[in-house]
């Protein structure tokens, strides 16, 4: 586990008598903030996931109103990093996006509004505790100035964060099996523990010291049900005491989406699904082309080359919305089988099996009839996840143990009544019947014949007596 | 206005090394990168590495592996890009180039060097 | 490495003609291509950066477009001074490298 920290050092007009004017003016005063988003720069998810490894929004810089006749200037800042906690090993090499967005501060309706300036992007190689790296990039008309490092956080060391160290607890070496830790020779390795007390069945850590809950529990072991039957609204924060849902005001009321566009509540904050032809937060882009990128997270932009005409993004797997900007609920494809929990941990899918089941989506089905004995010569049958018996004639329950009345489905037909015995079940029968449930009518003449077939049973089905 | 004006044409054995200079005016030097590509004849262009003015990091293609060393002198805006163990491979037109990293505006006027025994 | 391929490898046309060359990334590169322009016995001459983006003093009939691994520079009227090598060149990964160049030939 660690942290990747971007600090911008700068955004201006690029060098050039062609330099743009400032976003901001005296009519529409303006700050700028910046969105980093990081993704593991080699692995087949990177295409295909947002963020995978992380995003960060910065805080909001000074407002900024430009000097009437001055030339533009490198805009003010949000003080301080953006950093990207990651829970995982730091990969080594990732991809980046950078967005320069400008908020508007002046008489809007319903708030401040939003429009991207500039988004850079590149691939990078970067060890994990080493020194900062300085890039500089164009976008558009505008320039970018940064550096970015990854550092790991203790107990983590290493150039991909996934070393663990103490402090040695005897001066003089590790415990069995634990080597030091270079370059920190007087601490050791240490081993992954979750919190303590942090419950095996509803709990799981991915570092240590973590206890991180199943979809359904609350509490910092994970041991408290969430119940929302005696919570007045669904929405607001949730309360580790008591699992409740704790009402909130609402981030979509008002609907701060733009230009037709829908708005649904996010864990954080909200997320509005533009119509096409408008992006940006709010929606609130628009004239765009594909040569302007409006497709987010790996999509495909396709037509679109002058601002009348529409763009489509073609979006890659797990995307989705008209600029690719909604991730797919890829639990809602019910991946985890055999009643497995579906967990979306963003960078991957993981399923917790019920017990009898395994495997990356619970498809394997563990021997339940492993130590499991069905009583009175029944016999285990495999599957479910669970072990069930087929019992023996005159025998029912779950192990076989419950002796059956084998009567009780009345299976005497036309008034035969009913014996138990010791193989099963004996009919006797009404007059003018007979077989083995007294199914058969007997002809005056002595002679029987089969009727039509009884419900459940076809003609030439064999029939099946005791 | 921005100029990159580079050292003259040189003529190597194999074996040996060369340094070529690029001197940059015209703005603020150590505002930007100072990139050197090369170009064989007739081909190609291939990006070498670059050098930071401001913090003397250095970043190289490992086609070049440890024999490209890039340096700069302040006082004087100038880079240096030195190339060793030549091969008749290595003979080409080596530019520099003022940019970011993605980006070089602009290109010094080129630097033949050619290696021959 | 990423690769970039170009296409057509050469191309003759005539003055006032509309040209477009082609650039094929071998994987997708967002936005991050430049285009160059190269007479004999000269520097590279920057003309397009960030796919779209036209630098400075550079003649308005140059346009790029594209994004991801497809990418399009475009001459709207060719002029005699148009007629050179040009190259493509991404710059999302390092080492940033460049296309085999299109060279562009007075019919």
């Known amino acids: 586990a660690g942290v990747f920290e971007l600090q911008i050092h700068s955004f201006g007009p690029g060098p050039g008598p062609g330099a743009p004017r400032s976003p901001c003016s005296a009519r529409l005063p303006c700050r700028l903030f910046f969105r980093v988003c990081l993704k593991p720069g080699l692995s087949e998810e990177a295409a295909e996931s947002p963020c995978a490894l992380g995003a960060a929004l910065s805080a909001r810089g000074p407002v900024y109103t430009e000097q009437p006749g001055a030339p533009a200037p490198d805009l003010p800042l949000p003080d301080g990093l953006l950093q990207v906690p990651f829970r995982d090993a730091w990969p080594g090499t990732f991809s980046f996006i950078i967005e320069t967005w400008r908020e508007e501060l002046g008489d809007q309706i319903g708030g401040p509004a939003w429009s991207l300036l500039a988004r850079v992007a590149g691939r990078r190689r970067l060890a994990a505790g080493g020194p900062w790296a300085r890039d500089i990039q164009r976008a558009g008309a505008w320039e970018l100035r940064f550096s970015y490092r990854a550092r790991c956080e203790p107990p983590a060391v290493g150039t991909a964060c996934t070393r663990l160290c103490r402090p040695r607890s005897a001066p003089s070496r590790c415990g069995p099996g634990l080597r030091p830790c270079a370059p920190l020779e007087d601490e050791c390795e240490a081993p992954l523990v979750c919190r303590a007390g942090c419950s095996p069945e509803h709990g799981f850590c991915e570092q240590p010291g973590e206890c991180r809950c199943l979809e359904g529990w609350t509490g910092p072991l994970c041991t408290v049900p969430v119940s929302t039957s005696s919570c007045l609204s669904p929405r607001g924060p949730s309360s580790a005491t008591t699992g409740c849902l704790v009402p909130g005001p609402g981030p979509c009321d008002g609907n701060p989406c733009a230009n037709g566009g829908s708005c649904s509540e996010t864990p954080r904050s909200f997320e509005c699904t533009c119509p096409r032809g408008f992006y940006g937060l709010r929606c609130e882009v628009s004239g765009v082309t594909c040569a302007d990128g409006p497709c987010f997270n790996g999509g495909l932009c396709v037509g679109g080359a002058d601002p009348d005409s529409a763009y489509i993004c073609h979006c890659p797997p797990g995307f989705q919305g008209s600029n690719c900007e909604k991730r797919v609920d890829r639990c809602s494809l019910q991946p985890c089988r055999n009643g497995g929990l579906c967990l979306d941990l963003g960078h991957a899918l993981r399923c917790r099996c019920r017990a009898g089941f395994a495997g990356p989506r619970c498809e394997h089905d563990l021997d339940d009839c492993a130590g499991r004995a069905c009583a009175n010569g029944g016999t285990c049958v495999e599957g479910g996840g669970a072990h069930r018996c087929s019992c023996a004639l005159g025998f029912g329950g779950r192990d076989c143990r419950e002796r059956a009345d084998p009567c009780a489905a009345r299976p005497c037909a036309h008034g035969g009544r009913c014996y138990a015995h010791f193989s099963g079940l004996v009919c006797a029968c009404a007059p003018g019947y007979m077989g083995a449930r007294c199914e058969f009518p007997v002809h005056p003449d002595g002679a029987s014949a089969l009727p039509a077939a009884p419900p459940g049973l076809r003609p030439g089905d064999p029939q099946r007596y005791l | 206005q921005v100029q990159l004006v580079q050292s003259g044409a040189e003529v190597k054995k194999p074996g040996a090394s060369v340094k070529v200079s690029c001197k940059a005016s015209g703005y603020t030097f150590t505002r930007y990168w100072i990139h050197w590509i090369r170009q064989a004849p007739g081909q190609g262009l291939e990006w070498m590495g670059y050098?930071?003015?401001?913090?003397?990091?250095?970043e190289h293609n490992q086609n070049f592996k440890d024999r490209v060393t890039m340096t700069r002198d302040t006082s004087t805006s100038t880079v240096y890009m030195e190339l060793s163990s030549l091969r008749s491979e290595d003979t080409a037109v080596y530019y520099c180039a003022r940019g970011g990293s993605n980006f070089f505006d602009y290109w010094g006027q080129g630097t033949t060097v050619t290696v021959s025994s | 490495a990423i690769q970039l391929t170009q296409s057509p490898s050469s191309l003759s046309a005539s003055v006032g003609d509309r040209v477009t060359i082609t650039c094929r990334a071998s994987?997708?590169?967002?936005?991050?291509l430049a285009w160059y322009q190269q007479k004999p016995g000269k520097a590279p001459k920057l003309l397009i950066y960030t796919a779209n983006s036209l630098e400075d003093g550079v003649p308005s009939r140059f346009s790029g477009s594209g994004s991801g691994t497809d990418f399009t520079l475009t001459i709207s009227s060719l002029q005699p001074e148009d007629f050179a090598t040009y190259f493509c060149k991404q710059a999302y990964d390092v080492p940033p490298t460049f296309g085999g160049g299109t060279k562009l030939e007075i019919k």
């Open positions: 050098i930071n003015p401001t913090t003397v990091y250095t």
């Open positions: 994987e997708n590169i967002y936005y991050n």
